[in-house]
């Protein structure tokens, strides 16, 4: 039930990567508009994206206040010309989202290899510590700041001349690996949160190879 020509939102879906978090839903509006509300389990509702014809709402600013909280959102539907109108029960038509806990559920973005440096038979590979939109004391925190030792990286590396791969793990953003002198290697990294049960791994970083501009070589 609801106001004439107004339909409830459906397929409410959280899309979140490195804490940038957007709520999406359907349908594309026809003669109606939407308003989103978000709250923690114990908090008050806060309205966002007022009377919008979009079918998404950026809720990043709300969820970064405490990424370990569990959030619930709801999408209200109103007739386009009469946003004061309510459903038959005396309140606007709305639909609830699934619960969302950013710390446990945000997707890990594709990492980037910042640099690699060879010294003799050792190579130091550094992963860029991506900045998030999570703030503490007016500074944006990095992925490592937020996740600490919960975040590890897996490195895949192989000789440019062969298909045999090796792997290494780190709980920092650096790898120090042994290589054969005079051989060029290629590298790819993946972010992992082993304690999670879902959204545990990122996609692989772009492959970087020695002999290209990112690296440095020292005897």
């Amino acid at each position: 039930s609801g106001t004439t020509n107004t339909v409830a939102a459906y397929n409410l879906t959280w899309k979140s990567t490195n804490f940038k978090t957007i709520l999406e839903w359907e349908p594309k509006p026809v003669n109606q508009v939407y308003t989103v509300q978000i709250s923690t389990k114990s908090g008050d509702w806060k309205s966002k994206c007022f009377y919008t014809t979009d079918t998404e709402c950026d809720l990043t600013d709300e969820i970064v206040k405490d990424v370990k909280q569990t959030y619930l959102a709801r999408v209200f539907s109103y007739p386009a010309g009469n946003v004061e109108s309510t459903g038959s029960a005396g309140e606007p038509l709305y639909e609830n989202s699934p619960e969302f806990t950013p710390y446990l559920e945000t997707n890990l973005g594709q990492p980037t290899i910042q640099s690699f440096e060879q010294v003799g038979t050792k190579v130091n590979v550094t992963v860029e510590d991506e900045r998030t939109l999570v703030r503490r004391n007016n500074t944006f925190l990095s992925l490592r700041d937020v996740f600490g030792k919960d975040l590890i990286y897996t490195l895949y590396y192989w000789k440019s001349s062969s298909s045999g791969k090796k792997t290494a793990k780190t709980n920092t953003n650096e790898f120090l690996i042994d290589v054969d002198k005079g051989e060029n290697y290629c590298f790819s990294v993946q972010a992992v949160i082993p304690s999670r049960t879902v959204n545990r791994k990122s996609t692989d970083s772009p492959v970087e190879c020695m002999g290209q501009e990112k690296g440095e070589f020292r005897e």
Epitope: N171, I177, P194, S195, D204
Partner: antibody, heavy 117, light 107 residues
């Protein structure tokens, strides 16, 4: 619940190949790494290699490189290990195991491979 | 390749004893060290992950410690069901390597 169910015991001739399987349930193999471990009778554990089903990367112990191939079929949640040019010292129990990133937290029941003429 | 030296290779102990098993890596493995228990004709079972964390369902008498190259598995009060073989595993880099195992037998 998480389970790894391995294929049954195999008797193989020297010089031939075997392909054993490990069917996972209770989790998505693309979210984890999958490994194979060898244990000869009365001996310790030996890592053969592993695979990341999400991106198809496979890594092998140099001792097995060239003789072993580890693959994963994400549509059936099954991991395979093929071992070729079999010799008597390949007679062993082969275990598949799930790697969370912190540990091999779940193991299959083991597949006995006997190499004999 | 990283070598894992596990000691002792065997030990005899009584129920109630405190048992300590050590693993030494040939280089820093950054806590990517796990411990396993194996009973005859059974698959290994995960006990400790990330050097110090107790795996689900494992009794609290088991504990892990260490960092860098030196790691320890401790059983604070040995129980009858703890008689088994224990292995450490480094998975910080490939090839992954197991310790040689420690067989815990009844005195």
């Amino acid at each position: 619940q998480v389970q790894l169910l391995e294929s049954g015991a195999v008797l193989a001739r020297p010089g031939t190949s075997v392909k054993i399987s490990c069917k996972a349930s209770g989790f998505n193999i693309k979210d984890y790494y999958m490994h194979w471990v060898k244990q000869r009778p009365g001996q310790g554990l030996e890592w053969i290699g592993g695979n990341d089903p999400a991106n198809k990367h496979s890594m092998y112990d140099p001792k097995f490189q060239g003789r072993v191939t580890i693959t994963a079929d994400t549509s059936t949640s099954t991991v395979f290990m093929e071992l070729s040019s079999l010799r008597s010292e390949d007679t062993a129990v082969y275990y598949c195991a799930r790697d969370s990133g912190y540990a091999m937290d779940y193991w299959g029941q083991g597949t006995l491979v006997t190499v004999s003429s | 390749d990283i070598q894992m030296t596990q000691s002792p290779s065997s030990l005899s102990a009584s129920v109630g004893d405190r048992v300590t098993i050590t693993c030494k890596a040939s280089q820093d493995i950054k806590s990517f060290l796990s411990w396993y228990q194996q009973k005859p004709e059974k698959a290994p079972k995960s006990l400790i992950y990330y050097a110090t964390s107790l795996a689900d369902g494992v009794p609290s008498r088991f504990s892990g410690s260490g960092s860098g190259t030196d790691y320890t598995l401790t059983i604070s009060s040995l129980q009858p069901e703890d008689f088994a073989t224990y292995y450490c595993l480094q998975h910080g880099e490939s090839p992954y390597t197991f310790g040689g195992g420690t067989k815990v037998e009844i005195k």
